[in-house]
């Protein structure tokens, strides 16, 4: 009588997360008589995923009908896989007895589950920082199989050198995560700028995920401050006017003081934003020169964005 | 330990009905295929009926002698076989054994103690 | 239906000698390579014991010295050596179709 073979064709199984995966497995004869059980992994600590006569495997059925006449076919079909299935699956023949005595294996199959990375998520600076300062961003994607990915950064379609990129765990593992930082120089033309992180793997069919971040939410384009008079009008009023232009972002507060004395203090609120992304604000002070007898001293005091205040002042003669 | 118990039996006239149970206990009962089969001094051994499993949907096989008359059935929630028996006649008398068909060939590997049904007036 | 005839009907073996059992059917139960014939021992008071399936094969826990042999419709089963505990019953039984049926049984004696 020849010896019993268990033959498992397949040294390895790929399949995508979330479908189904077929485990083949045939027997070279009905004798003797005792079940087929499914195992992943091998030695004392194996698990089963499927024995035909004994126990409920909801996810696991047989290809074949199990009962149908002469049936040597015990290969299994395991639904809605996840990488936590990943492993090596052995078709374990027994001879009937009591109990059940182990007699042949299978070469097994490896299954390696192909999972889609996470959308990539960018997040930057908790504070920001202005023009010519450094900054950091950081893209994080979870959950693919296979471990090799591709991840790229770039700044206005513009690929980005500076970063630095590590998968975890260096060792086997279900499933992996991916942990990139970029380093961008800032500049006040940054305003619209944006970064992409972008994620290729086999899983997405050459369509990578792409994850983005605005430098709008990581710069401080502080403004340019100008104090100028008008000429002189004939109710002995004069017309001086702080311009702060080119700063981001809008948050400001601007505070007028006349001779050290606070006149006036106004918010931003509304304005129309340049083509760069950044606002310009005019603000008058009418100075009654006729009221002071010696020279005014105009201070105009702007509060961007939570920073320290900037002056800019100015004195308007008062003629004897 | 796998164990078959039958129930049911006793002593019925000629076009009676009785109903028989089988409890099963020690393996997953609805995985196996389950038979009756009767023993009598004039017949001996004479297979009765065969009930499959919820995948071959439930597939009912009888001998010709009972067939339009017994009824196999089984409850998978109770690990449990049943033969409702109408129209009883003299020739059913014997015991009748609940059986586990192992490998889906009349493979008769356990059968239970018994239980006997007499039929006379 | 397939039947099958069993003989002798009775048999009385001395103790440590061969008792043969034979079973022949009405038509082949072979099918696809594979005997579809068993072979069972009963005791008074008790239910049938399976010794043998697809008609050669020890069922687990039964002694080596039970075995069964044929194909296609000659079947024989072998007891050596004979041992008290063997007075019984023997019968044979085939799935090779529907319905199942089986031998008129064979009583052995051990003298």
């Known amino acids: 009588e020849e010896e019993l073979q268990v033959i498992q064709p397949e040294k390895s199984v790929s399949v995508a997360a979330g479908d189904s995966a077929t485990l083949n497995c045939t027997v070279s004869s009905l004798i003797p008589v005792g079940p087929i059980q499914w195992f992943r992994g091998a030695g004392p600590g194996r698990e089963l995923i499927y024995n035909l006569k004994e126990g409920h495997f909801p996810r696991v059925t047989a290809v074949s009908d199990p009962t149908k006449r002469n049936n040597m076919d015990f290969s299994i079909r395991i639904s809605n896989i996840t990488p936590a299935d990943a492993g090596t699956y052995y078709c374990v023949k027994f001879r009937k007895g009591s109990p059940d005595v182990e007699l042949k294996s299978g070469a097994g199959t490896e299954l390696s589950v192909r999972a889609k990375p996470s959308a990539p998520v960018v997040s930057g600076p908790a504070v920001r920082a202005t023009a010519e300062h450094t900054v950091s961003f950081t893209c994080e994607s979870h959950g693919f199989s296979p471990r090799d990915i591709t991840l790229k950064w770039f700044k206005n379609g513009n690929e980005l050198s500076d970063v630095q990129t590590n998968v975890d765990p260096a060792g086997k593992s279900v499933s992996y995560s991916i942990r990139s930082t970029a380093r961008v120089l800032l500049t006040r033309r940054d305003v619209h700028s944006q970064v992409i992180c972008e994620v290729a793997h086999v899983t997405l069919q050459g369509d990578p995920l792409r994850g983005t971040a605005n430098l709008s939410e990581a710069i401080r384009v502080p403004p340019f401050l100008e104090v100028t008079q008008q000429s002189m009008r004939a109710d002995n009023q004069v017309n001086v006017t702080c311009q702060v232009t080119k700063f981001y972002p809008q948050r400001l507060q601007l505070t007028w003081l006349e001779n050290g004395n606070v006149s006036r203090t106004e918010m931003a609120s509304a304005l129309p934003e340049n083509k760069d992304g950044t606002y310009n604000w005019t603000s008058w002070l009418l100075v009654n020169v006729s009221a002071h007898r010696d020279d005014v001293k105009l201070t105009c005091q702007v509060e961007h964005d939570g920073q320290p205040a900037v002056n800019k002042s100015f004195s308007v003669k008062v003629s004897a | 330990e796998v164990k078959l118990e039958e129930s049911g039996g006793g002593l019925m006239q000629p076009g009676g009905s009785m109903k028989l149970s089988c409890v099963a206990s020690g393996f997953t009962f609805s995985n196996y295929w389950m038979n009756w089969v009767r023993q009598s001094p004039e017949k001996g051994l004479e297979w009765v009926a065969e009930?499959?499993?919820?995948?071959?949907?439930?597939?009912?096989h009888y001998a010709e002698s009972v067939k339009g008359r017994f009824t196999i059935s089984r409850d998978d929630s109770k690990s449990s076989v049943y033969l409702q028996m109408n129209n009883l006649r003299a020739e059913d008398t014997g015991i009748y054994y609940c059986?586990?068909?192992?490998?889906?060939?009349?493979?008769?590997?356990?059968w239970g103690q018994g239980t006997t049904l007499t039929v006379s007036s | 239906d397939i039947v099958l005839t069993q003989s002798p009907a009775s048999l009385a073996v001395s103790l440590g000698q061969r008792a043969t059992i034979s079973c022949r059917a009405s038509k082949s139960v072979s099918t696809s390579g594979y005997n579809y014939m068993y072979w069972y021992q009963q005791k008074p008071g008790q239910p049938p014991k399976l010794l043998i399936y697809?008609?050669?094969n020890l069922e687990s826990g039964v002694p080596a010295r039970f075995s069964g042999s044929g194909s296609g419709t000659d079947f024989t089963l072998n007891i050596h050596p004979v041992e008290e505990e063997d007075a019984a019953t023997y019968y044979c039984q085939h799935s090779g179709e529907l319905p199942y049926t089986f031998g008129g049984g064979t009583k052995l004696e051990i003298k």
């Open positions: 059986i586990r068909d192992y490998d889906y060939d009349a493979y008769f590997d356990y």
């Open positions: 697809l008609a050669s």
């Open positions: 009930i499959r499993l919820k995948s071959n949907n439930y597939a009912t």
